[in-house]
């Protein structure tokens, strides 16, 4: 029961985690910037992995997608790759874990097969969660190291003067969603791996052994069947024959003075 609960909970936690990773990957708020309060209106910028957006206090919002692949920063490409790998692994893990669930019966699937599938999905969830956490952390590190506070280093460009806009780059909501989702997927994966141990069948087979006392405990019943004492039922290897004949499992019982007809 505990194994089923652990497996089921691991599945649900991973499902929520992967949904979160997908949500974080699609979100636009990975990086948010408060672009100075200019004389017109408060301009708020935010960027995601796929597009950049501008929002103004007037209510105007516009987003533009990154239509080029080659020109984008390598870090952004790396984060995209990590998030996509996380989603793909997580999705495959979910698919595998559905069939591995103890509460779902598929044909004559053995417990050992379910245990292996549970372990496989658990490992996939762990890797998926790590990918998401790594992706979000790489992006966060990129913000911290490069953009935390842009300094107004002015230099001359071809068309005149160029300066970096005084902007404070902060962590967007997507980063927190990604961290939490990655963590949940990781926890779910660990739970699946723990459940796998409980699902694995024990390999110890105990042979039914019948113990008989010598002589005095063996009686011939009127019906001609020998009554056997001891532990275990006479269903596996033992047949009781008329006249008290022994089977291959039995030890010969010799008549004694206590025997009676």
């Amino acid at each position: 029961m505990a194994v089923t609960a652990c497996q089921g909970l691991g599945f649900v936690v991973s499902l929520i985690g992967i949904a979160g990773i997908i949500a974080a990957t699609c979100m636009d708020q990975w990086s948010t910037q408060d672009l100075y309060n200019n004389p017109v209106t408060a301009v708020f910028n935010y960027q995601g992995l796929w597009r950049s957006c501008v929002r103004e206090s007037s209510g105007f919002t516009e987003c533009r997608g990154y239509f080029t692949l080659l020109g984008l920063p390598a870090m952004l490409q790396a984060v995209r790759a990590l998030m996509i790998v996380g989603i793909v692994l997580g999705a495959i893990g979910l698919l595998v874990s559905i069939f591995a669930l103890k509460c779902i019966r598929i044909g004559s699937m053995e417990d050992s097969a379910k245990a292996n599938m549970t372990l496989t999905s658990g490992i996939m969830f762990i890797v998926s969660g790590l990918c998401a956490i790594a992706g979000v952390s790489v992006f966060a590190n990129m913000l911290v190291t490069n953009f935390w506070m842009s300094t107004a280093n002015m230099y001359t460009g071809m068309g005149g003067m160029v300066q970096t806009v005084q902007t404070r780059y902060t962590f967007g909501a997507a980063l927190f969603v990604g961290w939490v989702a990655g963590g949940l997927t990781l926890i779910g994966g660990v739970m699946m791996c723990i459940a796998c141990r409980g699902l694995a069948p024990e390999e110890t087979n105990y042979k039914a052994v019948s113990y008989h006392a010598s002589g005095h405990s063996v009686a011939y019943k009127p019906g001609g069947f020998k009554a056997s004492t001891g532990f275990g039922s006479n269903t596996k290897n033992k047949k009781i024959y008329d006249g008290g004949a022994r089977t291959e499992d039995e030890v010969q019982s010799y008549p004694s003075k206590h025997d009676y007809v």
């Epitope: 209106t41 007037s58 516009e62 080029t68 780059y169």
Partner: nanobody, 122 residues
Framework: QVQLVESGGGLVQPGGSLRLSCAAS????????MGWVRQAPGKGLEWVAV???????NYADSVKGRFTISRDNSKNTLYLQMNSLRAEDTAVYYC????????????????WGQGTLVTVSS
């Protein structure tokens, strides 16, 4: 490389009109706020007008009601329609634009043009 090129300046009589243009070119991803700043002879920089991507505008008190700022987002072009010009409007007019580049959409820069001279004299 990004360039901001102003045009339309020249000599005009008081009460006359001029239309300045500023064209931004290069590997621009998105232009945010654009504006006009002027520098009269022997004086400091004075902001004239600004416009956001969503067309919210604001003007310096000295030009309110006389100047109109506008932009064409699709062409990355900024305009300044100057009417009822006065002698005190004589200055070099610079356009500036807050933009990010296609190669790094996560960092914003302010680019400035070389300026165009407007002379109001009779």
């Amino acid at each position: 490389q990004v360039q901001l090129v102003e045009s339309g300046g020249g000599l005009v009589q008081p009460g006359g009109s001029l239309r300045l243009s500023c064209a931004a070119s290069g590997s621009i991803f998105m232009i945010n706020v654009m504006g006009w700043v002027r520098q009269a002879p022997g004086k400091g920089l004075e902001w004239v007008a600004v416009i956001t991507r969503g067309a919210s505008t604001n003007y310096a008190d000295s030009v309110k009601g006389r100047f109109t700022i506008s932009r064409d987002n699709s062409k990355n072009t900024l305009y300044l329609q100057m009417n009822s010009l006065r002698a005190e409007d004589t200055a070099v007019y610079y356009c500036n634009a807050d933009l990010n580049l296609a190669s790094d959409p996560f960092k914003w820069y302010t680019y400035w043009g070389q300026g165009t001279l407007v002379t109001v004299s009779s």
